[in-house]
Amino acid sequence: GLECDGKVNICCKKQFFVSFKDIGWNDWIIAPSGYHANYCEGECPSHIAGTSGSSLSFHSTVINHYRMRGHSPFANLKSCCVPTKLRPMSMLYYDDGQNIIKKDIQNMIVEECGCS
Amino acid sequence: GLECDGKVNICCKKQFFVSFKDIGWNDWIIAPSGYHANYCEGECPSHIAGTSGSSLSFHSTVINHYRMRGHSPFANLKSCCVPTKLRPMSMLYYDDGQNIIKKDIQNMIVEECGCS
């Protein structure tokens, strides 16, 4: 997965820090106060849809085979720049019963982006 | 994740059968001869971006907080209808050295779709 460097507009991972205070979650999330969530942005030209490096690669390679041949309904299906690898992160927070919970929350951090 | 029923145009999972013969893979994939790969299609209006049910939900909920507040650069970031849950499938095939391999291939079947 590409890291965005400002030079290319092809699907890449952009660094982004989320502050839980900014989004009003600091009253139930004890720690951390924020984290590098990152996000995906950029174009998905046909030649990189479903290319290797994406964890969706088998499925998207198959679908891309049909898309590129103009097979209905895939011809009009947009390939999207989305997270293809996410990482969990440990959080300390209050649950609904105000108990303090320490838990690894799945799919918090975008590690890689790819074209769906 | 919604199943497409033809009545709604909101992000949903559409049934689709892939024939390996159709895409020229039948000379190296021994079994199966095809499979229900499925795919995702439909609109992602802002109110359903990052909704629960998606394996991206924590991350996309966070990003959606920023997007809904018109926070640059998320205001212009498109929410996409993409696979949020994929399932592996067992395949019997010839590898690069013409050895017969039986392997569970990850991310072959779309089980659920959601808005990124």
Epitope: H47, A49, T51, S57, M68 | D27, Y93, D95, D96
Partner: antibody, heavy 123, light 108 residues
């Protein structure tokens, strides 16, 4: 058996174009990608790009973007590589090779190669 | 892009000796998607090893590959006269596909 047979040697002037062909036989052409690799005299191997024989999807090496075009003709199971605005440093043996670029299945090595086509660029 | 560095550049050995060729990647090669090719003068490269350690069809068992991540090795247990050639490693984990600079195994 699998074979990739390439067109014959070419001599071109700087600024001209060359089109090398690669005819495949012994397998389902559309099930694979065709990659192009070149080798300057006495040098190592340089990947130029690939084309999916099924869909026509291409992926080119950045340094060749704008000068190279890869195409296929599925009716004759032939892949083509055209290189334009030739320079003396494009003098090389050009190879085609087949691969299945499916990472999830562990596939992607170049298992069969063409015999190579020598392209000489000289004024 | 992933840069592959092969060492040594030249290996001078006698038939019957063991050859150890190294290939180092500038970043991790995902899932060991690394291949080794043999090239003799005037010939196209030939696939020897794929997936870092699997032998291609018809390749004798004196050839073996090992390694993962960033460090990979091709070993020829007992050199035969026909093994004197140039050997290239290549990664197929990422685009662009890249090759190492090659190691020439020559007769001492």
């Amino acid at each position: 058996q699998v074979q990739l047979v390439q067109s014959g040697a070419e001599v071109k002037k700087p600024g001209a174009s060359v089109k090398v062909s690669c005819k495949a036989s012994g397998y389902t052409f559309t099930g694979y990608h065709i990659h192009w690799v070149r080798q300057a005299p006495g040098q190592g191997l340089e990947w130029m790009g690939h084309i999916s024989a099924y869909s026509g999807t291409t992926n080119y090496a950045q340094k060749l973007q704008g000068r190279v075009t890869m195409t296929t003709d599925t009716s004759t199971s032939t892949a083509y590589m055209e290189l334009r605005s030739l320079r003396s440093d494009d003098t090389a043996v050009y190879y085609c090779a087949r691969a299945r670029d499916i990472a999830a299945a562990g596939l992607g090595a170049f298992d069969y190669w063409g015999q190579g086509t020598l392209v000489t660029v000289s004024s | 892009e992933i840069v592959l560095t092969q060492s040594p550049g030249t290996l001078s050995l006698s038939p019957g000796e063991r050859a150890t060729l190294s290939c180092r990647a500038s970043q991790s090669v995902r899932s060991s998607y690394l291949a080794w090719y043999q090239q003799k003068p005037g010939q196209a490269p030939r696939l020897l090893i794929y997936g870092a350690s699997s032998r291609a069809t018809g390749i004798p068992d004196r050839f073996s590959g090992s390694g993962s991540g960033t460090d990979f090795t091709l070993t020829i247990s007992r050199l035969e006269p026909e093994d004197f050639a140039v050997y290239y490693c290549q990664q197929y984990s990422n685009y662009p596909r890249t090759f190492g600079g090659g190691t020439k195994v020559e007769i001492k």
